[in-house]
Structure formats: C-alpha cells, structure tokens
Interface confidence: low
C-alpha cells in the first residue's frame, strides 16, 4: 500500500469517532458524511450505523434504505444501508 493510502485510511478511521460526537465543531463533518451517505447509498465509515452512536436517533433519515437494489440491514429497528462509506470515500478521493 502507498503512504498516501495509509494516511487516508488512518485519517478516516480516526475521524469515525466524530460521527458519534455531540459538539458543534463536529457538526460540519457529520453533515458532509450525511450528504455522502445519501449520494453513495452507504452508512457510517467503519462499523456502519453503529459509528453514529446516539446521533443515529437524532438524524431522522440517516442511512435509510430506500433503494433496495443496494444491500440493506436492520439496525435499531430501521432498515439502513449495509455497506460502509470508507471504500466509497477512498475511491472518491483517489479520483479527485
């Protein structure tokens, strides 16, 4: 693996904890991931919906599986996208 690939990996894994944070400073990152999830039909970064912690309840449409062509799973009684976003984000960064 290249050094840049490793840095991207580490950065994304490190930022996973921001999804479950409740401070104002993390909101911008969370909102960016929400937009990305809707676009690429994925959920969370590493562990799926669980990455969002208690915030999962606070964003009503988070990860909601409306396109059943994509793999979905049940999480806290809701149907959510099964695939995590990390690989999509890495592909997106590589292409841009």
């Amino acid at each position: 693996k290249s050094k840049s690939d490793r840095i991207v990996n580490e950065t994304l894994y490190e930022n996973t904890k921001l999804l479950s944070a409740t401070g104002e400073s993390e909101k911008q990152f969370q909102e960016a991931i929400i937009v990305f999830q809707e676009e690429f039909k994925c959920c969370g970064l590493v562990n799926g919906a669980a990455d969002w912690g208690n915030n999962f309840q606070h964003y009503p449409e988070l990860c909601a599986c409306l396109d059943k062509q994509r793999p979905c799973q049940s999480y806290n009684g809701k149907q959510v996208y099964k695939e995590t976003c990390i690989s999509f984000i890495k592909d997106f960064l590589a292409k841009n």
Epitope: Q57, P60, E61, A64, C65, L66, D67, K68, Q69, C72, S74, G77, K78, Q79
Partner: antibody, heavy 121, light 106 residues
Amino acid sequence: QVQLVESGGGVVQPGGSLRLSCAASGFIFSSYGMHWVRQAPGKGLEWVAVIWYDGSNKYYADSVKGRFTISRDNSKNTLYLQMNSLRAEDTAMYYCARDHYGSGTYYIDYWGQGTLVTVSS
Amino acid sequence: EIVMTQSPATLSVSPGERATLSCRASQTVSSNLAWYQQKPGQAPRLLIYGASTRATGFPARFSGSGSGTEFTLTISSLQSEDFAVYYCQQYNNWWTFGQGTKVEIK
C-alpha cells in the same frame, strides 16, 4: 383483524387546510410503518407519504412536499395527515395504509376505506 | 422516479377464460413488486407481493411472475368476483403505482 378507519375529509376551498386522521386497531400500531395513498375520482392510485413505526423518518411525494405533514401518535393508535395550501388537484379519496415492515420500506398490506377530500371554490 | 406502465388499460374477458395482465418498470425493481385488486367503491386489497407470493384470502387461480422490469399477473379462469381494476406497485425505490388495468366482462 386489522382495521384502519379514516376521518376528517370534506370540502375545502383552494388554499385551505384539512387534517385527516386514521384510527388503527387489530394490530400493534407502534410496530408498523404507515402510508397515505390517494386516488383522484376515476383515476389511479398515487402514493403520498410514509412514516416509520417510531415517527423518526418521514417521506413525501414531490407533489405534496412542503404542504403536507404526516405524523402519528402511537399512544392513541392514530395516524395523521395535515394538509395545507390545498389545490384543486389534491381532490381525491385518501387512504390510510399499513406497511408490512416497521421502517415503511416494503409493500402495503392493509388499507382503510378512505376519506374523501374535495378542494373547490 | 421509477415509472410503472400497465397494459392493456382495459381487458375484456369472458368468465372462465384466462386473463393476462402486464406491468413494466422503467428500471429494475428486482422482485419488489406488488399487485392490488380494487373493486368499485372499495379500497384496494393486496393480492400479490414479492412479484409472485399470493396474499392471504386469494385463491390459486391468481398467480404472479417476473422480476427486474417485466411482470405478469395471470388469472387462470376468471370468476364473476374477479372483475375489477388491478394495480401493480413497485416498492424497490420509494413507491410508485401503475395506472391500472380494468378487467371487464366481455
């Protein structure tokens, strides 16, 4: 047996508001997603809105987005549709319907008998 | 939005004959398709879900088939109580209905 009984329909002027209710019985209401579907006189069925079992997710057809609000009161086993800025093209029979799944992403398995909404001056 | 197209709009059939109704999706909906029966003055009733699974209360003369974009509802031998309007609906991505097929007595 599953029963869905709509009420609140009637005649209203363009620009007016109306609130539809749907009383549910015969099943655990708080475990199911619920839809509103409408049917204009002599026309086909049009999906209007859906709400998750716990009220956390709500989705609307483009034709009603920003004007209609779906909500539910699980303690009262009741589904609601608040309809604002009504137009002539909203004239229809409005059906309350149950989704087969709690998160309201599957097929409709039970329907109410409907309540008629007429928008006319 | 996925557009559902049903054909024919009206089907004239004699009692005892076979009726074949078609439903086409503008993009794949896998097997996430339902059929509903609606009689005049009544609410629709779930007839078929998952493209081919018959709902409770409907006899074996009703059958559904297809997947992807092409679906068929077949009524093997029409009875008087089967004359109605039939709607297909996809629930693969949001929810959209076909315009309906009216099955009438010939």
